[in-house]
């Protein structure tokens, strides 16, 4: 808290300009009018104010707008945004995507701060859903943004927004998140032809069910091993050797290097060794010839 002192003669700020960087904290408090500051916020970012000086300017704005800043001020906060607390931001009503972009720009190149997370949360809740333009903006600044949302939050993403998602945006998503995103992607890309569809849907396949993988195996997609390794184990297990061979195409040879890792390991254990041998890859661990496989889950369902 800066104590109230009279502004020295001749130092009253007529405008927000670079001369203010030479003002002590108490001089800024005494000589800068809060209303002037609010109307000339766009100039603050052009001046190299220090941490301490910005504290004073923030204090002046807080006094002027105790209920929260208007969007006209928020849009021009610039680096002063970094001084805001999540509590400050919760008082704001940010509706313009331009305002959001301006504030995200300030933190560009740095990891998402609690302030940024709160701002995004306020913005998205205000809009009611994560529309395409917002998602486009957020993933441009924070590629991992989508994967930071809970499955419940992801459910509010409309299928049309999925077009904005790039493969790298899904890198840190877990299976529960992909379970929510995959059906939306399937819907979003449903009118595309085979090869184009696969290019778009590929990064979402960690949420695909068995029947969709079976369908893809009939389309000569040549799925790479990296994608295959991210598939749900429960979706891969029912696939036959022939289906996996068709799904992977020339990449099937990569199974050998992954035979000890899930889902390949678990899939091998479910296949007949005879069938695995047809691949000519030396995969071991399948069901020996002459053994009968009982599906106990099916038996329980019948009893």
């Amino acid at each position: 808290e800066v104590e109230k002192t009279a502004c020295p003669s001749g130092k009253k700020a007529r405008e927000i300009d670079e001369s203010l960087i030479f003002y002590k904290k108490w001089e800024l408090e005494a000589c800068v009018d809060a209303a002037l500051l609010a109307t000339q916020m766009d100039r603050v970012n052009a001046i190299p104010f220090t941490y301490e000086q910005l504290d004073v300017l923030k204090h002046k704005l807080d006094e002027l707008y105790p209920q929260g800043y208007p969007e006209s001020v928020i849009q021009h906060l610039g680096y002063l945004f970094l001084k805001m607390s999540p509590e400050d931001i919760r008082k704001w009503n940010v509706t313009s995507l331009e305002t959001l972009k301006a504030l995200l720009e300030v933190n560009k190149g740095h990891e998402m701060s609690p302030q940024v997370a709160t701002l995004i949360d306020r913005f998205v809740k205000g809009r009611g859903q994560l529309d395409k333009d917002t998602l486009d903006t957020l993933t441009a600044f924070y590629p991992g943004y989508l994967c930071s949302l809970s499955p419940e939050e992801l459910s509010s993403v409309p299928p049309s927004s999925i077009w904005a998602v790039r493969p790298q945006d899904l890198d840190t998503c877990d299976p529960r998140q992909l379970d929510v995103l995959y059906p939306k992607a399937r819907l979003a890309f449903q009118n595309m032809n085979g090869s184009e569809y696969f290019v778009k849907i590929q990064s979402f396949l960690g949420g695909a069910p068995t029947e969709d993988l079976k369908a893809l195996s009939q389309q000569n997609v040549s799925m790479d091993l990296a994608t295959f390794m991210k598939l749900r184990t429960d979706a891969v297990l029912p696939l036959t050797v022939a289906e996996v061979q068709k799904l992977l195409g020339p990449h099937v040879e990569g199974l050998k290097a992954e035979e000890r890792h899930r889902p390949v390991r678990d899939w091998i254990l479910r296949q007949r060794q005879d069938d695995l041998d047809t691949l000519g890859l030396g995969l071991q661990g399948g069901i020996p010839n002459g053994y009968l496989v009982l599906d106990l889950s099916m038996q329980e369902a019948l009893s």
Partner: nanobody, 114 residues
Framework: VQLVESGGGLVQPGGSLRLSCAAS????????VAWYRQAPGEQREPVAA???????IYADSVKGRFTISRDNAKNTVYLQMNSLKPEDTAVYYC??????????WGQGTSVTVS
């Protein structure tokens, strides 16, 4: 963000030095920047500044002697110091943008006029 100041040293009164400050990223090309100095036992104070628009301003004590400039391609800011006086003795720092707001500083470069 990393800030590396250099160019300081021991110089006689009336002599000159050119300080450089290099930053990681494109920090200086897009932001307002300033040179600050801190004499022993004193608070850090600004000596020269350049707005993001390119206009410059100087503390009264260095006007006409010091010149701030920047090279956006090299992401470097300079402080040309001429007609140095003993009272210019201090550790000099540069800063701007994100790191200035977050109160992150480099090691500074020491200038001694004697």
């Amino acid at each position: 963000v990393q800030l590396v100041e250099s160019g300081g040293g021991l110089v006689q009164p009336g002599g000159s030095l050119r300080l450089s400050c290099a930053a990681s990223g494109s920090m200086f090309s897009i932001n307002a920047v300033a040179w600050y100095r801190q004499a022993p036992g004193e608070q850090r104070e600004p000596v020269a500044a350049m707005t993001s628009g390119g206009s410059t301003i100087y503390a009264d004590s260095v006007k006409g002697r010091f010149t701030i400039s920047r090279d956006n391609a090299k992401n470097t800011v300079y402080l040309q110091m001429n007609s140095l006086k003993p009272e210019d003795t201090a550790v000099y720092y540069c800063n701007g943008g994100w790191s200035l707001v977050m109160d992150y500083w480099g090691q500074g470069t020491s200038v001694t006029v004697s």
